[in-house]
Interface confidence: low
């Protein structure tokens, strides 16, 4: 808590400039406007303050702003922005994507701080739901975004919002999240014709069910051992022979070297010796 | 019920090699992204690698990148530390996690639901 004393005579802020960065913390205190700091934030960032005289300025936002700062000081935060706690930041009301942006923008190549949770989580919240935009940006800053919500979370994703999505922001996914995607990937992709559908629901598939992966056989797609490995066990297992050769196409000799690994070992084990021989893939059931 | 054992910790001069295992029951292994943490005296819990179910996406702190490397058998329910360059800082108690919370990073510390005891690894000449 910064004590208060009187402005020293000539010394009161008329605007925020770089003199400022001259004043002691005290000074800062008694002779900077709160109100005239929130109109001038944009300022702020273009000033070298050190991390003690930013202090200063945020406490005088939050004497000013008791109950949360408007979005239009929001907005201007800069690296005032990382000296904010996740109580702070409840407090806000953040609707504007341009104000996400610039906030994001600011812890850019850093692992996602729990400010920055917290902030995504308000946006989210106060959306109502993932829209495309949104989930166009928060992957663009963080790619495994996506792959850091609960399934429960996942399930306010439109299915519009998926054509956003690229292959890597999904690559921390457990199933369970993949579960609640691949439907969506699905409806969003169901008017595209074959090869272009299989490019894009690729990525989802770890979700897919068993009738689906059926479909998908029938259709030359090529499925890359990769790909196959990350399906769904209980998915895999009912597929004949016939329908895991035609899956992967050229690719089925590289389930000799899977051959001990989920979900390749558990549906070797399903398969008869005679059906497996054809492969002649040396696989042993 | 949840049980991760780690094992493998010890004592070790600086420049060698521990490869410390983690096994784990009570949840299905395989649909889970595990994370190693190490805690040094008298300093917080960090991060230090964490592995998808896949295994790809794998990621390390940048003190150990280089240095160790994460696996996982999902048939042994086993994830692993390779530490290989040891150094005197690497001395901690070395944790695995599981249940990954949402809205967290992986090497994140809240980002977990469930510890194991921990293994003790000193590095010393």
């Known amino acids: 808590e910064v004590e208060k004393t009187a402005c020293p005579s000539g010394k009161k802020a008329r605007e925020i400039d770089e003199s400022l960065i001259f004043y002691k913390k005290w000074e800062l205190e008694a002779c900077v406007d709160a109100a005239l700091l929130a109109t001038q934030m944009d300022r702020v960032n273009a000033i070298p303050f050190t991390y003690e005289q930013l202090d200063v300025l945020k406490h005088k936002l939050d004497e000013l702003y008791p109950q949360g700062y408007p979005e239009s000081v929001i907005q201007h935060l800069g690296y005032l922005f990382l000296k904010m706690s996740p109580e702070d930041i409840r407090k806000w009301n953040v609707t504007s994507l341009e104000t996400l942006k610039a906030l994001l923008e600011v812890n850019k190549g850093h692992e996602m701080s729990p400010q920055v949770a917290t902030l995504i989580d308000r946006f989210v919240k106060g959306r109502g739901q993932l829209d495309k935009d949104t989930l166009d940006t928060l992957t663009a800053f963080y790619p495994g975004y996506l792959c850091s919500l609960s399934p429960e979370e996942l399930s306010s994703v439109p299915p519009s919002s998926i054509w956003a999505v690229r292959p890597q922001d999904l690559d921390t996914c457990d199933p369970r999240q993949l579960d609640v995607l691949y439907p969506k990937a699905r409806l969003a992709f169901q008017n595209m014709n074959g090869s272009e559908y299989f490019v894009k629901i690729q990525s989802f598939l770890g979700g897919a069910p068993t009738e689906d992966l059926k479909a998908l056989s029938q259709q030359n797609v090529s499925m890359d051992l990769a790909t196959f490995m990350k399906l769904r066990t209980d998915a895999v297992l009912p597929l004949t022979v016939a329908e895991v050769q035609k899956l992967l196409g050229p690719h089925v000799e590289g389930l000799k070297a899977e051959e001990r690994h989920r979900p390749v070992r558990d549906w070797i084990l399903r398969q008869r010796q005679d059906d497996l021989d054809t492969l002649g893939l040396g696989l042993q059931g | 019920e949840v049980q991760l054992v780690e094992s493998g910790g010890g004592l070790v001069q600086p420049g060698g090699s521990l490869r410390l295992s983690c096994a784990a029951s009570?949840?299905?292994?395989?649909?889970?992204?595990m994370g190693w943490f190490r805690q040094a005296p008298g300093k917080g819990r960090e991060g230090v690698s964490a592995?998808?179910?896949?295994?790809?996406?794998?990621v390390y702190s940048d003190s150990v990148g280089g240095r160790f490397t994460i696996s996982r058998d999902n048939s042994k329910n086993t994830v692993y530390l390779q530490m290989n360059s040891l150094r005197a800082e690497d001395t901690a108690m070395y944790y695995c996690?599981?249940?990954?919370?949402?809205?967290?990073?992986?090497?994140?510390?809240?980002?977990?639901?469930?510890w194991g005891q921990g293994t003790l690894v000193t590095v010393s000449s």
């Open positions: 996690a599981t249940d990954r919370r949402p809205g967290t990073t992986m090497l994140a510390v809240n980002g977990y639901n469930h």
């Open positions: 009570g949840f299905t292994f395989s649909r889970n992204t």
């Open positions: 592995i998808p179910y896949t295994s790809t996406g794998i």
